[in-house]
């Protein structure tokens, strides 16, 4: 990563590509993910992005990219983030002090609309997505499933 | 090295279409989404669209829709954008461009085309 | 869409001179700005993102500030290559859209 702090942040509320929320619940101890239809009115829960430069030439990287990348981590609470768990293909909250793993790190593609994605740092190819209500890890094969709606997001303000 | 060269100047008839070519070289073509920006002359700079050269997939600015088709051939590492049903107030610079971040949009343009002249007049 | 508005339209500055260009857009882009200066039958060339980040090659006299919906380029001292039109850029949305423009001249 290019530099320690980010170059901004940014809270917003996530939702899935067919506007279902993402969201937080305490539940013994730990933190839970889920992916469900809120009631009108109902508040959503906000996450602090993180946005970082990441500038490496492809011989170094083995992703094939050349140049700047953005890598975004994501805090829905003070010292959680989000983590990808590639064992387990699954997305978890831990907590954890800077500096953070790689695995809570994930580059962001927003080349499809407003939409966008979030590819793990630590396994190029495979995406935050929804899967049963719940996010998981998805391996993502052919360009074209770039576009498939289970690994889309939206970031909102409100 | 790293650029991107398109076609040369076009003079069309009201009416006509153009399509401008855009050949990109020197990085990871499918890495990076393309836009186009036109430029009327004295005038400012207006965003047309991009394409996603990954999986194709494109965004256009409203007010070219139904006109505009960004298409892509990743053998070539080539972009193209046609307008069509062009009228004289389509005459401008038409730059191919692209982003300074692979993947993403949000840290500006950094790599542009040279540009192409299209003139439409009767 | 969002709408970026520039101001001034024109400004007239010697050598030297501290010149400051502010973009406002219409709803708020976080950080997600881009400057470029375009000079005569020349493509743009970006100088600053992420609203104060300066781009690789760009000297250190260019600056930028703001986050949100009200934005500053700074030119701290300016100098004869300077002379150009300055644009902003939100880049936070499709469809991205440009301020109308600066018109840096010799006074």
């Known amino acids: 990563i290019t530099g320690i702090s980010p170059i901004t942040e940014y809270l917003a509320s996530l939702s899935t590509y067919n506007d279902q929320s993402i969201t937080f619940a305490l539940e013994d101890e730990s933190y839970e993910i889920y992916v469900e239809d809120l009631k009108k009115d109902e508040k959503k829960d906000k996450v602090l992005l993180s946005y970082y430069e990441s500038q490496h030439p492809s011989n170094e990287s083995g992703d094939g990219v050349d140049g700047k990348m953005l890598m975004v981590t994501l805090s829905p609470t003070k010292d959680f983030w989000l983590h990808a768990n590639n064992k387990e293909h699954s997305v978890e909250l831990h907590k954890c002090e800077k500096p953070l793993p790689d695995q809570a790190f994930f580059v962001l593609h927003n080349m499809h609309s407003n939409c966008v994605s979030f590819e793990c740092k630590t396994d190029p190819g495979v995406f935050i997505g929804v899967k049963d209500n719940h996010l998981a890890l998805i391996k993502v094969d052919s360009s074209e499933n770039l576009c498939t709606e289970n690994i889309l997001f939206k970031l909102s303000e409100t | 090295q790293v650029q991107l060269v398109q076609s040369g100047a076009e003079v069309k008839k009201p009416g006509a279409s153009v399509k401008v070519s855009c050949k990109a070289s020197?990085?990871?073509?499918?890495?990076?989404?393309m836009h186009w920006v036109r430029q009327a002359p004295g005038q400012g700079l207006e965003w047309m669209g991009e394409?996603?050269?990954?999986?194709?997939?494109?965004s256009y600015a409203q007010k070219f829709k139904g006109r505009v088709t960004m298409t892509r051939d990743t053998s070539t590492s080539t972009v193209y954008m046609e307008l069509s049903s062009l009228r004289s107030e389509d005459t401008a610079v038409y730059y191919c461009a692209r982003p300074s971040a692979a993947y993403s949009h949000y840290l500006g343009i950094d790599l542009w085309g040279r540009g192409t002249l299209v003139t439409v007049s009767s | 869409d969002i709408q970026m508005t520039q101001s001034p339209s024109s400004v007239s500055a010697s050598v030297g001179d501290r010149v400051t260009i502010t973009c406002r857009a219409s709803q708020g882009i976080s950080s997600w700005l881009a400057w470029y200066q375009q000079k005569p039958g020349k493509a743009p060339k970006l100088l600053i993102y992420?609203?104060?980040r300066l781009q690789s090659g760009v000297p250190s006299r260019f600056s930028g500030s703001g986050s949100g919906t009200d934005f500053t380029l700074t030119i701290s001292s300016l100098q004869p290559e300077d002379f150009a039109t300055y644009y902003c850029q939100q880049a936070n949305v499709f469809p991205l859209t440009f301020g109308g423009g600066t018109k840096v001249e010799i006074k």
């Open positions: 020197g990085y990871t073509f499918i890495s990076y989404g």
């Open positions: 394409i996603n050269p990954h999986g194709g997939s494109t």
């Open positions: 992420a609203a104060s």
